[in-house]
């Protein structure tokens, strides 16, 4: 359970946002590879892709959603499919990639300030009480935001994107959930990996900004899997 | 621009106690963790305690932990440290820190001995 | 406990590029790809110079910059120049503590 891995500072003083809002197809965050606690199981890589079974958008990576892979095709069976670039069809936010929406059945660019806020976010409520184990279940919540009179600057706190000021998103920061810069080139950022487990991620990067996309850092091939460096590169 | 003033550090008795105080200004307080950290003569840093933008969190280091309460009033932009049952090795000067993307600015620190 | 090692001292000469390193291990700094680096003039307040690994504030020189492999981050400055003459501070955090965890310090 979380209290014999969390030894010193209560659990009780736990922030809501450190279960707070994890990267999901259509968000502007995205979960940086954290530890995997006891009890957790290993994420499964991208890079070796094979068909992945889920029943939800929030089981598959932040660059994929959950659907059948024919068309029409059995409901029952769904898989983790690769999110759809701008102007392709869709049918739902989580269709479009990080940085997109769905608008009219096509994926538009989400990079003006507007939108961001209609973004739903995963809230994984894995520390809801004293028992709470650190399989945590996830749902869907709209958040309130009309507490916020401003537009959230970089490091304030924040309920969801729509929080933070323009170039910036609401991401996962240690102890709480803060607005940080989309990520210019060169800057690390998260390659996502499927979400076999609701491990405790405590840091969230933004996505990359317009025209670039997270790639393996060129020089950190010879570093091992679980620490390799990626960067947003130009496409 | 962003400004953090502490003062209430000064010359204590082992066994005894203090309150550290940290006015804040030049950004939206409230919505700002905070933090306390600090440095003994000659050493390095070590963080002390963090506290959420609404109270509602605080997180304390071992060596601290059940003697120093951090507290904060936002209505004064104003972070505290009460620290009680002080030992010779709390002797450091200490700095309040906002904690936005990591420590990101800092007041110029005050002295406990 | 997370321990964040660099060397206690690195010199230059004006002009040169040093680099400085912050080892940790593979459930702190090789797991979570996360740090900060601050400089430390005598007598002032630490400055954030670096976060998430190689990410500069505004208005810190592009002299200064981050990276990390495997373990080890480290932080390098190049086209040394006098006033960078200070100590430095790694930072990263403690996920079973719930705490922030500094380095040693290298004074430059």
């Known amino acids: 359970t979380l209290n014999s891995v969390l030894n010193s500072n209560a659990i009780k003083n736990l922030p809501p946002p450190l279960g707070g809002a994890a990267g999901h197809p259509g968000s502007a965050v995205s979960a940086a590879p954290g530890i995997l606690y006891p009890g957790g199981n290993k994420y499964q890589t991208i890079d070796n892709y094979q068909p992945y079974p889920c029943a939800e958008d929030e089981e598959c990576g932040t660059d994929e959603y959950c659907a059948s892979p024919t068309r029409g095709g059995d409901a029952g069976v769904q898989i983790c499919l690769a999110c759809r670039k701008r102007r392709k069809r869709c049918m739902r936010h989580a269709m479009c990639c990080p940085g997109n929406y769905c608008k009219n059945g096509i994926c538009v660019s989400s990079d003006q300030n507007h939108f961001r806020g209609e973004i739903e976010e995963t809230i994984t409520e894995s520390f809801g009480n004293d028992h709470s184990t650190l399989d945590g279940y996830s749902r869907r919540t709209t958040l309130s935001s009309k507490m916020y009179h401003t537009k959230g600057q970089e490091g304030s706190v924040c309920l969801r994107s729509s929080d933070c000021a323009s170039g910036l998103c609401c991401a996962r920061h240690f102890w709480s959930k803060i607005c940080k810069p989309v990520l210019k080139e060169g800057q690390v950022c998260t390659k996502h990996r499927r979400k076999g487990s609701h491990g405790l991620e405590i840091f969230q990067r933004c996505y990359c900004g317009e025209g670039l996309s997270c790639r393996i850092q060129k020089d950190h091939h010879q570093a091992s899997n679980s620490s390799r460096l990626h960067t947003c590169q130009r496409h | 621009q962003v400004q953090l003033v502490e003062s209430g550090g000064g010359l204590v008795q082992p066994g005894g106690s203090l309150r550290l105080s940290c006015a804040a200004s030049?950004?939206?307080?409230?919505?700002?963790?905070m933090s306390w950290v600090r440095q003994a003569p000659g050493k390095g840093l070590e963080w002390v305690s963090v506290?959420?933008?609404?109270?509602?969190?605080?997180y304390y280091a071992d060596s601290v932990k059940g003697r120093f309460t951090i507290s904060r009033d936002n209505s004064k932009n104003t972070l505290y440290l009460q620290m009680n049952s002080l030992r010779a090795e709390d002797t450091a000067v200490y700095y309040c820190?906002?904690?936005?993307?990591?420590?990101?600015?800092w007041g110029q620190g005050t002295l406990v001995t | 406990d997370i321990a964040l090692t660099q060397p206690a001292s690195v010199s230059g000469s004006p002009g040169q590029s040093i680099t400085i390193s912050c080892t940790g291990t593979?459930?702190?700094?090789?797991?979570?790809?996360?740090v900060s680096w601050y400089q430390q003039h005598p007598g002032k307040a630490p400055k954030l110079m670096i976060y998430?690994?190689?990410n500069r504030p505004s208005g810190v020189s592009n002299r200064f910059s981050g990276s990390k492999s495997g373990n080890t981050a480290s932080l390098t400055i190049s086209g040394l120049q006098a006033e960078d003459e200070a100590d430095y501070y790694c930072?990263?955090?403690?996920?079973?503590?719930?705490?922030?965890?500094f380095g040693g310090g290298t004074k430059l």
């Open positions: 593979s459930s702190d700094l090789g797991g979570y790809n996360y």
């Open positions: 998430d690994v190689n």
């Open positions: 820190a906002r904690h936005g993307i990591d420590f990101d600015h």
């Open positions: 930072q990263t955090y403690d996920q079973i503590k719930l705490s922030a965890v």
């Open positions: 030049g950004f939206t307080f409230s919505s700002y963790w």
């Open positions: 506290i959420s933008s609404d109270s509602s969190s605080t």
